[in-house]
């Protein structure tokens, strides 16, 4: 019961996490710029992985996609790749984990197969969560170190004077969504891996039991595969081979012609 609960909870937590990773990847607010008060209108600029948006104080908002790949920083491309890998792995993990759920019966699937699938999905969730956390952290680091900010505050170009208005970009909501979602996916994956241990059928260690035949005094002891005649050095029914069991190893039986030990 505890295994089913752990597996089910792991699945739900991972599902929420992956939904969060998808949401974060699609969000525009990865970085937000402090409000810039222009004499005409206050301008608020925010950017995501796929497009840049500007909102005016009037409420007018315009978003433009990054249509070129060549002009984008390599780090941004890396963040995109990490988030997509995270989503893909998470989606595959969800698909695998649905079939691995103990509460769902599919044909005559054995527990060992379900355990393997649970472990696989768990590992996928862990890697997915790590990808999301890594992607969001790389982007956050870019903002902190002003990776893509213009270094010059003012310079004179062909068309006159160019002045950098704002270099302070702060963490957007998408970063926090991404961190939380990645963490949830990671936790869900760990729970699935824990559930896998409970699902795996353990090898049964049978204890040695002696079966006394009614007619002949013969002791059958599983575990050993050596036989001795009842004569000679083993007349006291001493153990020739001990399979590790201790239940009735010392039971006294009179030597007979065929004494299986």
């Amino acid at each position: 019961m505890a295994v089913t609960a752990c597996q089910g909870l792991g699945f739900v937590v991972s599902l929420i996490g992956i939904a969060g990773i998808i949401a974060a990847t699609c969000m525009d607010q990865w970085s937000t710029q402090d409000l810039y008060n222009n004499p005409v209108t206050a301008v608020f600029n925010y950017q995501g992985l796929w497009r840049s948006c500007v909102r005016e104080s009037s409420g007018f908002t315009e978003c433009r996609g990054y249509f070129t790949l060549l002009g984008l920083p390599a780090m941004l491309q890396a963040v995109r790749a990490l988030m997509i890998v995270g989503i893909v792995l998470g989606a595959i993990g969800l698909l695998v984990s649905i079939f691995a759920l103990k509460c769902i019966r599919i044909g005559s699937m054995e527990d060992s197969a379900k355990a393997n699938m649970t472990l696989t999905s768990g590992i996928m969730f862990i890697v997915s969560g790590l990808c999301a956390i890594a992607g969001v952290s790389v982007f956050a680091n870019m903002l902190v170190t002003n990776f893509w900010m213009s270094t010059a505050n003012m310079y004179t170009g062909m068309g006159g004077m160019v002045q950098t208005v704002q270099t302070r970009y702060t963490f957007g909501a998408a970063l926090f969504v991404g961190w939380v979602a990645g963490g949830l996916t990671l936790i869900g994956g760990v729970m699935m891996c824990i559930a896998c241990r409970g699902l795996a059928p353990e090898e049964t260690n049978y204890k040695a039991v002696s079966y006394h035949a009614s007619g002949h005094s013969v002791a059958y002891k599983p575990g050993g595969f050596k036989a001795s005649t009842g004569f000679g050095s083993n007349t006291k029914n001493k153990k020739i081979y001990d399979g590790g069991a201790r239940t009735e190893d010392e039971v006294q039986s009179y030597p007979s012609k065929h004494d299986y030990v």
């Epitope: 970085s31 710029q33 810039y36 222009n38 005409v40 209108t41 301008v43 600029n45 950017q47 840049s52 500007v54 005016e56 104080s57 009037s58 409420g59 007018f60 315009e62 433009r64 990054y66 002009g71 984008l72 920083p73 941004l76 893509w148 900010m149 213009s150 170009g157 068309g159 006159g160 004077m161 160019v162 002045q163 950098t164 208005v165 704002q166 270099t167 970009y169």
Partner: nanobody
Amino acid sequence: QVQLVESGGGLVQPGGSLRLSCAASGSIFHIPVMGWYRQAPGKQRELVAGISRGGTTNYGDSVKGRFTISRDNAKNTVYLQMNSLKPEDTAVYYCNVLVVSGIGSTLEVWGQGTLVTVSS
């Protein structure tokens, strides 16, 4: 890099009209605000008129009712239609644009200026 090309300045008689234009080009994602400022000899630079991407306009007190600002978003161009010009409108007119250039850099770009002289 963002460049501004201004045109339309010159000598005009009082009561006359002029049309200034300013085209922005280069690495541009957005131009939230485009506008015109002016600086007369020995005076501070002042706002003449500005227009946002959404169509919000703002005019300097001295030009209200006489000047009209407009923009062509497709061409990244701003126009200033100046009517009923007065001698006190004589100044160097500077184009000013707020540009989101590339990812994460917001620039305020100034043109080199075009001289408008109102004299009889």
